[in-house]
């Protein structure tokens, strides 16, 4: 799990105007919005005898800064004011007294784009290294969370689904996880980079989406992944099958992945018919769906109660009326745009209350 996105070092050991003062830093670094990067940096300066015992202060400034007016974006000088928009996100991680000017950027934002220069001060020795400068490029966040489904999803049986963002860095602001599901859910434990959703699927959750949304509040950027729950009927040796979808939302049965102890095509056809009948009943009995929002320390808390017991009613579309049979796969990671997870029935009949509960669970 990469804690810091370290790019290949494009070392630029260019000499500054005064050959006694030099600095080595990569000239360009790229970081995705919301993520972080550590930029290694080394500098050298002559030390006159009268400044030997003076503390070394280092500063990173935006290009074009006027030293006597502009605040730096980062510094190790405790009483020095820094730029408001970089406070807590830009850190002079290196120790200037050891000639280290390494810069750490967390929760990268679009407006961090630009060039930066380093300045050192040691007593009366002061120098701004105008060359080389560090050019920071902040790009779109392309990483997306992974959803992990362990084993088989069975109606009435609780399972822990994990949404993880292993590519995020430890130093950044912990992301806010939001789960969106039509199935009955509750919140499990979470770590800095993962959230667990306890799901208890029902027969009518066939075809519904389950979304894990991750917001990096430090940068105000959001990424998500959606999987689709696909109900299947396997009377014995129940298993779960996961099919990567093409993002179109259409479901399909793929040849070569249909497994199960079903003797003969006729039985299969009969079961498929039964399944269609079940979902016809589900559709006709569907009532108003309930949407529950559970917020915990969210920057944008949802309205309504913080308990799933008190649900806010809202009209939502129920599950789609399509079916497919699927086969085996134990623990699976979701990595495509849209996926199909199967729910296996053990000859169960749908309960009389077949309304869809559509809940969103937010975690932070």
């Amino acid at each position: 799990m990469p804690l810091l996105l370290l790019l290949p070092l494009l070392w630029a050991g260019a000499l500054a105007m005064d050959p006694n003062f030099w600095l080595q830093v990569q000239e360009s670094v790229t970081v995705q919005e919301g993520l972080c990067v550590l930029v290694p940096c080394t500098f050298f300066h002559p030390i006159p005898y009268y400044d030997k015992n003076s503390p070394v202060h280092g500063y990173w400034f935006r290009e074009g800064a006027i030293i006597s007016r502009d605040s730096p974006v980062a510094t190790n000088k405790l009483d020095q004011e820094v730029q408001e928009e970089t406070q807590g996100r830009f850190r002079l991680l290196g120790d200037p007294s050891r000639n280290n000017c390494s810069l750490s950027i967390v929760d990268a934002r679009r407006r961090d784009n630009g060039s930066y220069f380093f300045r050192m001060e040691r007593g009366s020795t002061k120098y701004s290294y105008k060359s080389p400068q560090l050019s920071v490029h902040v790009t779109d966040l392309t990483h997306r969370p992974k959803i992990l489904i362990p084993g088989t999803l069975e109606p009435g049986h609780s399972k822990n689904l994990t949404c993880s963002v292993s590519w995020a860095c430890e130093q950044g602001t912990p992301p806010i996880f939001s789960w969106l599901s039509a199935a009955p859910t509750s919140l499990g434990p979470r770590t800095t980079h993962s959230s667990v959703l306890i799901i208890t699927p029902r027969p009518q959750d066939h075809g519904t989406n389950l979304t894990c949304q991750v917001k990096f509040a430090g940068a105000g950027v959001t990424t998500e992944r959606t999987i689709q729950l696909n109900v299947t009927y396997v009377p014995q040796n129940p298993t779960t099958g996961i099919f990567p979808g093409d993002g179109s939302g259409k479901q399909e049965t793929r040849a070569g992945v249909v497994h199960g102890a079903i003797g003969g095509a006729g039985v299969t056809a009969l079961l498929a018919l039964c399944l269609c009948l079940i979902f016809f009943i589900v559709k006709t009995h569907r009532r108003k769906a309930a949407r529950t929002a559970v917020g915990r320390n969210d920057t944008h808390p949802t309205t309504g109660s913080a308990s799933p017991k008190h649900q806010k009613k809202s009209k939502l579309h129920g599950p789609t009326e399509t079916s497919s049979c699927s086969g085996a796969a134990p623990t699976v990671e979701m990595d495509e745009e849209l996926h199909y997870a199967s729910l296996n029935f053990h000859g169960m009949n749908p309960s009389k209350d077949t309304s869809t509960e559509y809940s969103e669970v937010r975690t932070q």
Partner: antibody
């Protein structure tokens, strides 16, 4: 010859906001700083804040913190000063002034705009 | 904040005579580079202020040589060797060493 051209006079009601512009004609001002200084009728000069049009860095006087916002548009060589929650005491002439620097050496506010009169009255 | 104090606040002068304005700062305006970050400005009636002196003693371009600045640390003086009618207005000293930038109260020079 560098000139700072300011927007026209404004009359505002208490509680409203005003946004004054200051456009540099001639050489671009991106290697300088722009200070905003106001002068109430019959009073002295009062510094409100400063913006570096190149870095975008700003510094505001404590008195105006939270009420003043200074921004810049480098494509048009224009800086803006917005003052919110106006009160009658904000009635003044607002000047933008170019602060000239060479490296770390300060050369004073060598170019001033003609001023924008802002009247706050109900 | 650095407090700037000017004296006198009013200065009536006969044309051709010298004039002197004093400015005192609450803390030293001497920068680590050896220069004093003190300016003098003149605001003529109905006009914007104009820079006369920067870095304590350097004359701005276009400023007549009858204007001179002196002093260091906390005590500064603006001298006009021979006052002319066009010199009337309010003179301000200003420290540019640190923000917030602060001005003196102003000295009104008028012709007797």
């Amino acid at each position: 010859q560098v000139q700072l051209v300011q927007s026209g006079a404004e009359v505002k009601k208490p509680g409203a906001s005003v946004k004054v512009s200051c456009k540099a004609s001639g050489n671009t001002f991106t290697s300088y700083g722009i200070s905003w200084v106001r002068q109430a009728p019959g009073q002295g000069l009062e510094w409100m804040g400063w913006i570096n049009p190149n870095s975008g860095g700003t510094k505001y006087a404590q008195k105006f913190q939270g009420r003043v916002t200074m921004t810049r548009d480098t494509s048009t060589s224009t800086v803006y000063m917005e003052l919110s929650s106006l009160r009658s005491e904000d009635t003044a002439v607002y000047y933008c002034a170019r602060e000239s620097w060479f490296g770390e050496l300060y050369y004073g506010m060598d170019v001033w705009g003609k001023g924008t009169t802002v009247t706050v009255s109900s | 904040d650095i407090v700037m104090t000017q004296s006198p606040l009013s200065l009536p002068v006969t044309p051709g005579e010298p004039a002197s304005i004093s400015c005192r700062s609450s803390q030293s305006l001497l920068h680590s580079n050896g220069y004093n970050y003190l300016d003098w400005y003149l605001q003529k009636p109905g006009q914007s202020p104009q820079l006369l002196i920067y870095l304590g003693s350097d004359r701005a371009s276009g400023v007549p040589d009858r204007f001179s600045g002196s002093g260091s640390g906390t005590d500064f003086t603006l001298k006009i060797s021979r006052v002319e009618a066009e010199d009337v207005g309010v003179y301000y000293c200003m420290q540019g060493l640190q923000t917030p930038i602060t001005f003196g109260q102003g000295t009104r020079l008028e012709i007797k």
